[in-house]
């Protein structure tokens, strides 16, 4: 039979690290180029939607997000090709019948417009001018993204490390 | 119409960052702990597999990927609960007709003993004890892990960014 | 071991078929794009034919449109490509090589020895 | 599809030489430029990614520089395991294209 869900106790105790200076990543790795606080990796080969996360999240990273308006005009402003399309990380929740960030936030309305079906197994990619929605299944390139975060963090001693 | 999937042409020129050595995470950050090369971060909330494997993205981390024996019995002696279930990044390929982790290596024979179905929609949980299958849309909890990397690596200057 | 070794390299007439294998080991096979590369007896190199880590998108070179099929087996962690319509001028040693990241085509680090394939009649 | 050209097509140096080799692409290609060894009866080796990363295990007298369409291979202190021919090879877009190839001979 299998285990219940049920109330978390992990022993962190015995597996603490000293308490250093955590230097966070100062400037972007080979592949990936900076465009403000993230570093992006544009590929070049293609995926469906659930590889394209599934590789971004083994690269240590996350399929793109968004924050506004000027967010998507700077990432479509290096779309070079206007036959290139990209997976970002925002597919349709059916069960909560919305747009949803892999971050588990809702696209509110205000936000990117999407063209396309709103319905199952439908992921959205961006193009140098619009963004689109698709079936997740479709093969096309990705975004991945890391935070690039300049200001090194103390880690407090008494924290979970 | 939708942009078709062709050649990619991304600007990478204008988007340089200096060349700065780049320190790599030299310790785990608050809520995660040290097990050997990985820093882990074992969920308090539940969710299904997939949405598991969206937060270990956005979190720019992996579900878990356990090399071997000694890795899951290191992982199973820090769960204290034994009716407490975690994700791992393990899931049915139905297409492969196999187990196959997030970074695309398949189970081999002598790795995890799973007990449950091989069959679609099946995903892959341990225990304190055991490593389970279970349908995908199970709310559970989850384990992401970072590599632990104590080299610094140099960025080449005329490299990209 | 990381390792791709070809098979299935020999001598065919013009206008015949050759089916080449390519087995990979000791890496996550279906994570990568996987190319063939050949070089004929004493030339350079010259890119064949790219196929997507699950399979679905196919790339070759002008000089074998039509003729060759690029396909993969994740689950034997194989790669294969058909050659139909054989001519002279596709004698070479056909390589398959893995890109150093998973995210693209090229920047090969892995390469496998080789197979001959010499179209004669 | 996108032309390189390299130059020298061969070379003659010594060991201790430093020796350069020149890629030319008829279009941009930023940094997507890679630079192969290859000894003969043997597969090519990956020695330079992304214009100038050096690919591990690869000594450091192998260096790469440029972007856009002029690329340079330079080896500081030729060897005698060195003497090979060089391939650069494109990859921003497809079809992938190599350079025509570059001997490194013995003086």
């Known amino acids: 039979q299998k285990p219940s869900i049920g109330k978390c106790s992990v022993d962190i105790q015995q597996n603490r690290t000293k308490t250093t200076e955590r230097p966070d990543l100062l400037n972007c790795p080979i592949y990936w180029q900076q465009v403000q606080e993230k570093c992006l990796l544009f590929s070049h080969t293609v995926n469906p939607w659930n590889n394209s996360l599934a590789d971004c999240s083994t690269k240590e990273s996350s399929l793109l997000l968004i924050q506004d308006k000027d967010e998507l005009t700077r990432t479509q402003n290096l779309i070079h090709d206007k036959a290139i399309s990209f997976w970002i990380g925002l597919n349709f929740s059916l069960s909560e019948k919305n747009w949803k960030w892999i971050n588990g936030s809702f696209l509110s309305s205000n936000d990117l417009k999407i063209t396309g079906d709103a319905k199952e197994n439908s992921c959205v990619y961006i193009s140098q001018t619009s963004v689109y929605s698709e079936y997740c299944s479709t093969e096309m390139k990705w975004i991945c993204q890391k935070e690039l975060t300049l200001v090194r963090n103390k880690v407090s001693p008494d924290s979970w490390l | 119409q939708k942009p078709s999937i062709g050649k990619c042409s991304v600007d990478i020129q204008q988007n340089r960052t200096k060349t700065t050595e780049r320190p790599d995470l030299l310790n785990c950050p608050i809520y995660w702990q040290q097990v050997q090369e990985k820093c882990l971060l074992f969920s308090h909330t539940v969710n299904p597999w997939n949405n598991s494997l969206a937060d270990c993205s956005t979190k720019e981390s992996s579900l878990l990927l356990i090399q071997d024996k000694d890795e899951l019995t290191r992982t199973q002696n820090l769960i204290h609960d034994k009716a407490i279930s975690f994700w791992i990044g393990l899931n049915f390929s139905l297409s492969e007709k196999n187990w196959k982790w997030i970074n695309g290596s398949f189970l081999s024979s002598n790795d995890l003993k799973i007990t449950g179905d091989a069959k679609e929609n099946s995903c892959v949980y341990i225990s304190q004890t055991s490593v389970y299958s279970e349908y995908c849309s199970t709310e559970m909890k989850w384990i992401c892990q970072k590599e632990l990397t104590l080299v610094r690596n140099k960025v080449s200057p005329d490299s990209w960014l | 071991e990381v390792q791709l070794l070809e098979s299935g390299g020999g001598l065919v007439q013009p206008g015949g078929s050759l089916r080449l294998s390519c087995a990979a080991s000791?890496?996550?096979?279906?994570?990568?794009?996987m190319s063939w590369v050949r070089q004929a007896p004493g030339k350079g190199l010259e890119w064949v034919s790219a196929?997507?880590?699950?399979?679905?998108?196919?790339y070759y070179a002008d000089s074998v449109k039509g003729r060759f099929t690029i396909s993969r087996d994740n689950s034997k962690n194989t790669l294969y490509l058909q050659m139909n319509s054989l001519r002279a001028e596709d004698t070479a040693v056909y390589y398959c090589?893995?890109?150093?990241?998973?995210?693209?085509?090229?920047?090969?680090?892995?390469w496998g020895r080789g197979t001959l394939v010499t179209v004669s009649s | 599809d996108i032309q390189l050209t390299q130059s020298p097509s061969s070379v003659s140096a010594s060991v201790g030489d430093r020796v350069t080799i020149t890629c030319r692409a008829s279009q941009t290609i930023s940094s997507w430029l890679a630079w192969y060894q290859q000894k003969p009866g043997k597969a090519p080796k990956l020695l330079i990614y992304?214009?100038?990363s050096l690919q591990s295990g690869v000594p450091s007298r192998f260096s790469g520089s440029g972007s856009g369409t002029d690329f340079t291979l330079t080896i500081s202190s030729l060897q005698p395991e060195d003497f090979a021919t060089y391939y650069c090879?494109?990859?921003?877009?497809?079809?992938?294209?190599f350079g025509g190839g570059t001997k490194v001979e013995i003086k």
């Open positions: 090589a893995k890109p150093l990241d998973s995210s693209f085509w090229a920047d090969f680090d892995l």
């Open positions: 090879q494109q990859q921003s877009v497809l079809p992938i294209t």
């Open positions: 992304a214009a100038s």
């Open positions: 000791g890496f996550t096979f279906g994570t990568f794009a």
């Open positions: 196929i997507s880590g699950v399979g679905g998108t196919t």
